[in-house]
Interface confidence: low
Amino acid sequence: DTHKSEVAHRFKDLGEEHFKGLVLVAFSQYLQQCPFEEHVKLVNEVTEFAKTCVADESAENCDKSLHTLFGDKLCTVATLRETYGEMADCCAKQEPERNECFLQHKDDNPNLPPLVRPEVDVMCTAFHDNEATFLKKYLYEVARRHPYFYAPELLFFAARYKAAFAECCQAADKAACLLPKLDELRDEGKASSAKQRLKCASLQKFGDRAFKAWAVARLSQKFPKAEFAEVSKLVTDLTKVHTECCHGDLLECADDRADLAKYMCENQDSISSKLKECCDKPLLEKSHCLAEVENDEMPADLPSLAADYVESKDVCKNYAEAKDVFLGMFLYEYARRHPDYSVMLLLRLAKAYEATLEKCCAAADPHECYAKVFDEFQPLVEEPQNLVKQNCELFEQLGEYKFQNALLVRYTKKVPQVSTPTLVEVSRNLGKVGAKCCKLPEAKRMPCAEDYLSVVLNRLCVLHEKTPVSEKVTKCCTESLVNRRPCFSALELDEAYVPKAFNAETFTFHADMCTLSEKEKQVKKQTALVELVKHKPKATKEQLKGVMDNFAAFVEKCCKADDKEACFAEEGPKFVAASQAALA
């Protein structure tokens, strides 16, 4: 339905608080280097303008599209050219090209300092002095570091952030109350950002058909009692919401997400018995709850799929008449029966089924040709099952840190051209799959593990796209979304790689090592491990373990010494020499 003024429509739908929050997020995700104050000024100007349009929708410029209004506002930033370089050229374009141009310049790895957490008393004072500014600063800092963060969900995080401070700044032990909550928000936020980044990559790189297939599979697992027509409707609406958010249309996205939540809560009987507790919550919490809702119980009497998809003589006729609907139906029926499969596996099975029909429906005896199609699924199912089993056994044997190290070695050998910080970040996150998924019951392990790995590998793909260095990474990232993980799993030692020259500087450490947190120490050691593998890609596990054990002993010894710096200066070169000898 059309409105005379789009900006007035969204302001009225969302309310001033959410409107301002979303505009701040949008601007911060586009202009990631701009200072906070600059963004607040722009947001205030847009808000005042929106209010004039609410008062009179026929007022000057109120009929302009949101892209035009926001783009015009961004292009008023005086330092655009010096801060962003060629991004300033976007301002010479007309909509919709200008918005596309801004989107292309979003930086997944912006050169921003890590966020340092001040003392609790300092934070509480800032919160009490100016709560509104404090919360805006949170939105700004998260959005600029995560330019694809799901905007309406970020408002939910901000609400939780506010609640944590409101509660804990009055507590007897502020730190004990606040710090665990902030840690939880940080970890959940990073996970949420990475999950959304995969959704946007899926839409942007593989199109909405790929996203819709993902959504059919996931929603069918969550809502196995819902019928196909219902799942299809939810998929269509969800695709619109994510297309908008990934495209920078944050006001429309938040508005449509609220409509979807309303629809789901009004139609619970047709969707899932699990929605009830979500639907009593306020909007932001409700939408979050619906997105995270557990799978409903599977209907007890589901018949075999073979009747409709293998044994029926009408398979090819049905497929030919409506390929996407027929495949969608197959995916729905398979997914609702298999909450124990990862979404990516379900999509591989649908792809295999489609390939079989394409081949067999052109054969002399189609039925004979596709009669064994379900048997062909077995190796596809067993591959991730075995992978999860082996890696969980390894995780249980080694613990998280050493499991991460095993993955660091494995991935550095596969793709040694990738930058060391990226290999460390990605392998550390791959390693977290153990603690996240291996403790779960068997039926939940594969969906947890493989779908989490897809999110982490997407981060590798996104970072690699910015600075491509490996043909193998490009191939795995671009050929097939659903086969990314198997593609990376199948990579072997890169025989063509010319080992990196040894650089003593890389293995020189100082007394500041001793004051680092446990996590920072791990990252230092893991950085050294990656560099070792890049220097000696054919080093055995035993050789690398020996070097890393010596490294840990050397650091521990020097951190206990009275003159730490002198110890590092003396023992460091010995460690380097011993390592070179061990790896020779």
């Epitope: 196909f228 027509a229 047709s270 409709d308 029926s312 006729k317 049905n318 139906m329 029926e333």
Partner: nanobody, 115 residues
Framework: EVQLVESGGGLVQSGGSLRLSCAAS????????MSWVRQAPGKGPEWVSA????????RYAESVKGRFTISRDNAKKTLYLQMNSLKPEDTAVYYC????????GSQGTQVTVSS
């Protein structure tokens, strides 16, 4: 948009007959198996009967076997359920679904069998 609209329900004496229809739109009707499902007051949905896309293969719940007949007219994009020898326990809202689902996705049509 996928739409299913049921009709033909009503009040009938025990032993009587009714014929339910389900008009489909928004998808290739002939490509999909269809089912009839019913929900009695205060109870969960119960699968009644199913038919494949071509109309050759039909299946029935034990409680309706021999009394109900499912059929379809793909040219008219319509699914039917002929209900004979109706009993009070057949009283429910009847609705059609795509595939083998037992979830309510449409408004349904009320069937009331009085004794």
């Amino acid at each position: 948009e996928v739409q299913l609209v049921e009709s033909g329900g009503g009040l009938v004496q025990s032993g009587g007959s009714l014929r339910l229809s389900c008009a489909a739109s928004g998808f290739t009707f002939g490509s999909f198996g269809m089912s009839w499902v019913r929900q009695a007051p205060g109870k969960g949905p119960e699968w009644v009967s199913a038919i494949d896309g071509g109309g050759a293969d039909t299946r029935y719940a034990e409680s309706v076997k021999g009394r109900f007949t499912i059929s379809r007219d793909n040219a008219k994009k319509t699914l039917y359920l002929q209900m004979n020898s109706l009993k009070p326990e057949d009283t429910a809202v009847y609705y059609c679904t795509i595939g083998q689902s037992t979830s309510r996705g449409s408004q349904g049509t009320q069937v009331t069998v009085s004794s």
